[in-house]
Amino acid sequence: LKGQEFAPSHQQVYAPLRADGDKPRAHLTVVRQTPTQHLKNQFPALHWEHELGLAFTKNRMNYTNKFLLIPESGDYFVYSQVTFRGMTSECSEIRQAGRPNKPDSITVVITKVTDSYPEPTQLLMGTKSVCEVGSNWFQPIYLGAMFSLQEGDKLMVNVSDISLVDYTKEDKTFFGAFLL
Amino acid sequence: LKGQEFAPSHQQVYAPLRADGDKPRAHLTVVRQTPTQHLKNQFPALHWEHELGLAFTKNRMNYTNKFLLIPESGDYFVYSQVTFRGMTSECSEIRQAGRPNKPDSITVVITKVTDSYPEPTQLLMGTKSVCEVGSNWFQPIYLGAMFSLQEGDKLMVNVSDISLVDYTKEDKTFFGAFLL
Amino acid sequence: LKGQEFAPSHQQVYAPLRADGDKPRAHLTVVRQTPTQHLKNQFPALHWEHELGLAFTKNRMNYTNKFLLIPESGDYFVYSQVTFRGMTSECSEIRQAGRPNKPDSITVVITKVTDSYPEPTQLLMGTKSVCEVGSNWFQPIYLGAMFSLQEGDKLMVNVSDISLVDYTKEDKTFFGAFLL
């Protein structure tokens, strides 16, 4: 007897089948950050809540020290939203020196780090000029796309200025990934 | 004979396998809304088209009375885009009373209602200050993320001001969810 | 002997099972575009990188001549981000003629073309008024949703003004789809 005689004829298995509920998945939510001084060309990584409220990690997808660890190779959908808030920005051609934290832009980057590769890879970037006159401002940047990731890859979210990130609600700023 | 001898050796089934085409899914599109009085701390829910044009519900995912009903427990990707449009906004420190359609912010919330739990849970929020001087304005807010939902949960989309929602095209304002 | 005796009792197969790694998928990234004359009511399509860097197509999902070709019918998640950049925009009521790169709006449309159907279908639209005073500006528009597509459908991304698209980095402007 051949095994395939007993599988439905339409099954066409080319690769291991696996139950969807068993796939690596994570949804991380914002926590209070250390409000560091904004350095022009250095984008700090956010850290995240991984188990309270809406946050979870499952099926060997682990969170540690600002990184999501990819436990198996495959195609993942990766997403993040960061809500920024700030005071009136400086957006004229002539900038005034010494005006603290009135940014002309806000940026989110989802970055992949591979230990065997020296340079991190920027997977996704959302960047926006900010020119808000006359009031405080707030706005989200959303990113999401599919990437082929390898076991051992690490994902993080970097921002242009950590002190502008809205950490007040878990639904405003978040980061997630799931194996397709 | 043992049954597993006839399944491919790489199958590694840890949970019920199921055909992807059988999973609960919905994509809902905007319809003209009933104008409601804008209440400061109460965000009205949008209602949706669920079967015409690009809209559909399938595999026991049902739409009723502004809610998407979750037919089985699991991890879902939930998304929405709302396009807002309005007249010149008020964005100076001094606001003028009684200026209709001149918001200082626009907000979208995807909310989960669980009958056994008294308070709705905000899953996702996109909120943006609006400071547009000298012309009418329009802009989208997009949200999407993965959540562990339970059978019987209900999802809705709430907005800060229903009268600002662009209901003119099904591709501008929409709401969807699918079981992963 | 009946075949189902040899399948796990919880399998409940209603439709062909298939390995997830075998599903059509693509992530395309931006390349330098051919500048086209901006026509008011005609939105040009972007062309894309499909194999270098982060870009890939797999499992019969092919890219050709600005189109992603859908190789089999099913429900797909389709997404795109386009980052726009421009000089100071015109946003007063009175517009000045002949001012290049000073748009009053930016728009992204993900369009489906079905050969048997004369008119393209707009699946997703992100449109935003641009009123940036006193400086150059840049900002992304992100779109993503699920659609029931048919074998042979073609997907493209159209923009309101190709000359404003930021083609400088693969993480800023991208387009993808995957079978659920």
Partner: antibody, heavy 120, light 107 residues
């Protein structure tokens, strides 16, 4: 050694605006949250709100409509304004530094406290 | 907001005894955000424990903290005369809150 020194009017009439200032000595504004906390006589502590070096504020929802916290980086000072005060706002008001490092957060330095009494 | 409930309201003990103070949260709290403070009359609060279990600089080792989720405990292994004061637990989420306090008095 970081020191927080605070001052402001101690006696107010109902409907007036409470105004307090806290000076930070021996430390940087950057990298911390700068808080106001109050304690009514014989009662517990209530967090009022905070500001970071970027001027971004976060307020107790119950007081949000009446509170403004601001900072003056040039003087290493931050300030509290509470409008439309009533007798219920009578309390000792403290400024405090909020320290957050690698997800651990706490108030590590406190001002000496200022008793504010609201009475007609 | 997260409500912290401390018990008992007042604890009467003698020097040399062991004191156990409880703090219960209305919902789960990150352990790393849970702190304990001591306050004496006319003074500002003083940090004792942070991250639920780490002693602040200069705090004697008779003070210890434990717990996770919604239940946290401050223990003083052998009470010294200077330990009689009011103790507050505090969570440092996006909207920080304090417990109502436990008064530790000499029996």
């Amino acid at each position: 050694q970081v020191q927080l020194q605070q001052w402001g009017a101690g006696l107010l009439k109902p409907s007036e605006t409470l105004s307090l200032t806290c000076a930070v000595h021996g430390g940087s504004f950057s990298g911390y949250y700068w808080n106001w906390i109050r304690q009514p006589p014989g009662k517990g502590l209530e967090w009022i709100g905070e500001i970071n070096h970027a001027g971004i504020t976060n307020y107790n929802p119950s007081l949000k409509s009446r509170v403004t916290i601001s900072l003056d980086t040039s003087k290493n000072q931050f300030s509290l304004k509470l409008t439309s005060v009533t007798a219920a706002d009578t309390a000792v008001y403290y400024c405090a530094r909020g320290y957050c490092r690698s997800t651990t957060c706490y108030f590590d330095y406190w001002g000496q406290g200022t008793l504010v009494t609201v009475s007609s | 907001e997260i409500v912290l409930t401390q018990s008992p309201g007042t604890l009467s003990l003698s020097p040399g005894e062991r004191a156990t103070l409880s703090c219960r949260a209305s919902q789960s709290v990150r352990s790393s955000y849970l702190a304990w403070y001591q306050q004496k009359p006319g003074q500002a609060p003083r940090l004792l424990i942070y991250g639920a279990s780490s002693r602040a600089t200069g705090i004697p080792d008779r003070f210890s903290g434990s717990g996770s989720g919604t239940d946290f405990t401050l223990t003083i292994s052998r009470l010294e005369p200077e330990d009689f004061a009011v103790y507050y637990c505090q969570q440092y989420g996006s909207s920080p809150t304090f417990g109502q306090g436990t008064r530790l008095e000499i029996k």
